[in-house]
Interface confidence: low
């Protein structure tokens, strides 16, 4: 993994120990960012639909990437856009939704082993020569002596989930991205009530593990909209 590189571009499958949001694909643009109350775990989304401005992918929500809203548009104006689903056109991994990556300009399903191998090879080749093309486009990266060739353990800095060991995903923690555990059955997950109702989170939870989906907890159906608890449940 790249244990010395923080806040990468192109990380999907993201997100917190505290509040946070694992966004939902489908929105055209992001809403204003979520707010985490310092020191607590109350999380609040501002429910207006202003496009969230960004400089790069790290500043967007889980299932978003940073780009100009108009095709070939003004490079100076970028906002968070919804990730692209399988078989959609892409220019870099960040544009593809969780579980996919950009190959030959198309979002394809991640065969994790193949993808991880590809990432590892790229890192190995670039070690020491200050060049890396992990995001599908050239990006200079200094790889310090802290770069290990084993998969990132929990807490290791990562570029994307494929940098993390099995059972972990790459998720935002403050101003960096680290490997965090994929959620297990019964664990609290974050699902937004409305498409596009998320933006930047200080923290992010991982997604639910294989065979699980983030759904409202049965005994919380009657609860108020703001307090409904979502957990990872069997399909």
């Amino acid at each position: 993994t790249l244990n010395s590189v923080l806040n990468s571009n192109a990380i999907k499958n993201l997100p917190p120990p505290l509040g946070g949001a694992a966004g939902h694909p489908g929105s055209a643009v992001s809403a204003a960012p979520g707010i985490l109350y310092p020191g607590g775990n109350k999380y609040q989304t501002i429910d207006n639909y202003q496009p969230y401005p960004c400089a790069e992918d790290e500043e967007c929500g889980t299932d978003e990437y940073c780009a100009s809203p108009t095709r070939g548009g003004d490079a100076g104006v970028q906002i968070c856009l919804a990730c692209r689903k399988r078989r959609k056109r892409c220019m870099r991994h960040a544009m593809c939704c969780p579980g996919n990556y950009c190959k030959n300009g198309i979002c394809v399903s991640s065969d994790q082993n193949h993808f991880r191998g590809e990432i590892e090879e790229t890192i190995t080749e670039s070690f020491g020569n200050d060049h890396s093309t992990l995001d599908g486009y050239s990006r200079r990266t200094t790889l310090s002596s802290k770069m290990y060739h084993t998969k990132g353990q929990e807490g290791s800095v990562c570029l994307r989930s494929s940098d993390c060991a099995s059972g972990l995903c790459c998720a935002r923690h403050f101003w960096s991205k680290i490997c965090k555990p994929v959620l297990k059955e019964g664990q609290v997950c974050t699902k937004h009530r409305r498409k596009g109702s998320h933006g930047l989170e200080i923290f992010q939870r991982c997604y639910c593990g294989e065979g699980l989906s983030c759904r409202i907890q049965k005994d919380h159906h009657q609860a108020s909209n703001s307090s409904r608890l979502h957990t990872c449940q069997r399909h």
């Epitope: 505290l18 680290i178 200080i202």
Partner: antibody, heavy 118, light 107 residues
């Protein structure tokens, strides 16, 4: 070799302003979140502020919120801390540091002393 | 805010001693706990991150353990260069908070 070099400290009157700089070298500056930590004379460490690698996200301690502004210029490999409405309790050595795993700070500058006194 | 309570605030020890410093968080911080060493007039130095991961270049006599609210920094055999002040830092919740420090002095 990774190096962080702070500058801009000095003596300033209460209510005054200072701008600290932290020049980074030996690593790809724009690939790292950065932070400011301070230490009052004879006291412990206090986290002040942090910024994401693009500068899009900033974080502040309550004690400086609304008075201090963290920023960075990735083209110049430099981190900044604009300090306004300075108070006597802001007197401290200010360190810039690079963020690593678990939000830890793996490389630190040597520090620059800010003295707020009339 | 999460309070970090470090103890003891100071201790006297001899070269070769086993030294243990503890840090208690006011709420569960999982393993988002780092340890630093600081010598007079110098910047802090990262020793341990993620509660137990040894920073590269740090001697193996330093070790960290704990999770949740209780954490420990252990120096298995104190060396002359280890006399310094040690701080813990939680990075689980903004604002990040340091412990008050433990000064390790020569007995």
């Amino acid at each position: 070799e990774v190096q962080l070099l702070e500058s801009g400290g000095g003596l300033v009157q209460p209510g005054g302003s200072l701008r600290l700089s932290c020049a980074a070298s030996g690593f790809t500056f724009r690939s790292y979140g950065m932070t400011w930590v301070r230490q009052a004379p004879g006291k412990g460490l206090e986290w002040v502020s942090a910024i994401s690698r693009s500068g899009g996200n900033t974080y502040y301690a309550d004690s400086v919120k609304g008075r201090f502004t963290i920023s960075r210029d990735n083209s110049k490999n430099t981190l900044y801390l604009q300090m306004n409405s300075l108070r006597a309790e802001d007197t401290a050595v200010y360190y810039c540091a690079r963020t690593y795993s678990y939000g830890s700070f793996d490389y630190w500058g040597q520090g620059t002393l800010v003295t707020v006194s009339s | 805010d999460i309070q970090m309570t470090q103890s003891p605030s100071s201790l006297s020890a001899s070269v070769g001693d086993r030294v243990t410093i503890t840090c208690r968080a006011s709420q569960n911080i999982k393993t988002y706990l780092n340890w630093y060493q600081q010598k007079p007039g110098k910047a802090p130095k990262l020793l341990i991150y993620g509660a137990s991961s040894l920073e590269s270049g740090v001697p193996s006599r330093f070790s960290g353990s704990g999770s949740g609210t209780d954490f420990t920094l252990t120096i298995s055999s104190l060396q002359p260069e280890d006399f310094a002040t040690y701080y813990c830092l939680q990075t689980y919740s903004v604002p990040l908070t340091f412990g008050g420090g433990t000064k390790v002095e020569i007995k």
